[in-house]
Interface confidence: low
């Protein structure tokens, strides 16, 4: 297979060389080439240049990551960092800060709370939530972290859930929950993390994060 690829590459390279040579001959005004031929070749070349420039712009806009093989399959990845919030909502807040990743505009962090993807496919989605709680100060219910999905035209759905009982340590004991799984996402799908008590979440460096990676 590799040998065939090599032959194909060399053939393409030869065609490119012939094409570039022809342009050169056009520019030097060689008599053996008709004017019409030269015009056609020149406009073809201009078209290529235009395409290259447009691609460059698109790549700049869409990509801070290197493309995987073929422009049809760009790498899509995000990793965001927890953000303390004054809101009482159970949905955790995230930010593009510290050592975060946002590969391109095919994944976005919306309203600081959900990661939204633009391409359909299989994604590995994960979240780590570190919390500090005390059995006496907390309710009887365990601390629960949920990874949820919201798809256009679909109701919210819990993808993953984990529960930890509260620590007896004082003032509180640190514990971490890790959630992760592979799920098919539709264009426009959003994922977010819900917890029973956001006030117990630890926002120190590296403690609480959330991300996804298109497989």
């Amino acid at each position: 297979h590799r040998r065939l690829d090599k032959i194909e590459d060399e053939r393409n390279l030869h065609e490119d060389f012939v094409f570039m040579k022809t342009i050169q001959r056009c520019n030097t005004g060689e008599r053996s080439l008709s004017l019409l031929n030269c015009e056609e070749i020149k406009s073809q070349f201009e078209g290529f240049v235009k395409d290259i420039m447009l691609n460059k712009e698109e790549t700049k806009k869409e990509n801070s990551f290197e493309m995987q093989k073929g422009d049809q399959n760009p790498q899509i990845a995000a990793h965001v960092i927890s953000e303390a919030s004054s809101k009482t909502t159970s949905v955790l807040q995230w930010a593009e800060k510290g050592y975060y990743t946002m590969s391109n505009n095919l994944v976005t962090l919306e309203n600081g709370k959900q990661l939204t993807v633009k391409r359909q496919g299989l994604y590995y989605i994960y979240a780590q939530v570190t919390f500090c709680s005390n059995r006496e100060a907390s309710s009887q219910a365990p601390f629960i972290a949920s990874l949820c999905l919201k798809s256009p035209g679909r109701f919210e759905r819990i993808l993953l859930r984990a529960a930890n009982t509260h620590s007896s340590a004082k003032p509180c004991g640190q514990q971490s929950i890790h959630l992760g799984g592979v799920f098919e996402l539709q264009p426009g799908a959003s994922v977010f993390v819900n917890v029973t008590d956001p006030s117990q979440v630890s926002h120190g460096t590296g403690f609480t994060s959330f991300g996804l990676l298109k497989l």
Partner: nanobody, 119 residues
């Protein structure tokens, strides 16, 4: 027991407006996303619109975007669908929909209210 009671349907001329309501009971209304689905004569269910628990998230099918507006009043346990610039193809039975707690993309719905758009 979950109860969803739709009202506000009727006969309306093309270009006209209607406001559908859905009175919900038997569950904690504010804890759920809610939505509207419809079924045209001889056709399958079509998703129309959806709203988040606190009203901040809304979704509309392309066919109704810009014409329909979903809203909710959590204090009254009521869901609304304001339908403007109605077209003949909007003729259907409209159902109020609530997700089932642990089911995947399935929902409870009411008896429905018929909307007929005709001149």
């Amino acid at each position: 027991e979950v109860q969803l009671l739709e009202s506000g349907g009727g006969l309306v001329q093309p270009g006209g407006s209607l406001r559908l309501s859905c009175a919900a009971s038997g569950f904690t209304f504010k804890a759920y996303d809610m939505g509207w689905v419809r079924q045209a004569p001889g056709k399958g269910l079509e998703w129309v619109s959806q709203i988040g628990r606190d009203g901040s998230f809304t979704y509309y099918a392309d066919s109704v975007k810009g014409r329909f507006t979903i809203s909710r009043d959590n204090s009254k346990n009521t869901l609304y669908l304001q339908m403007n610039s109605l077209r003949a193809e909007d003729t259907a039975v409209y159902y109020c929909a609530k997700p089932r707690r642990y089911a995947i993309f399935t929902f409870d719905r009411g008896q429905g209210t018929l909307v007929t758009v005709s001149s």
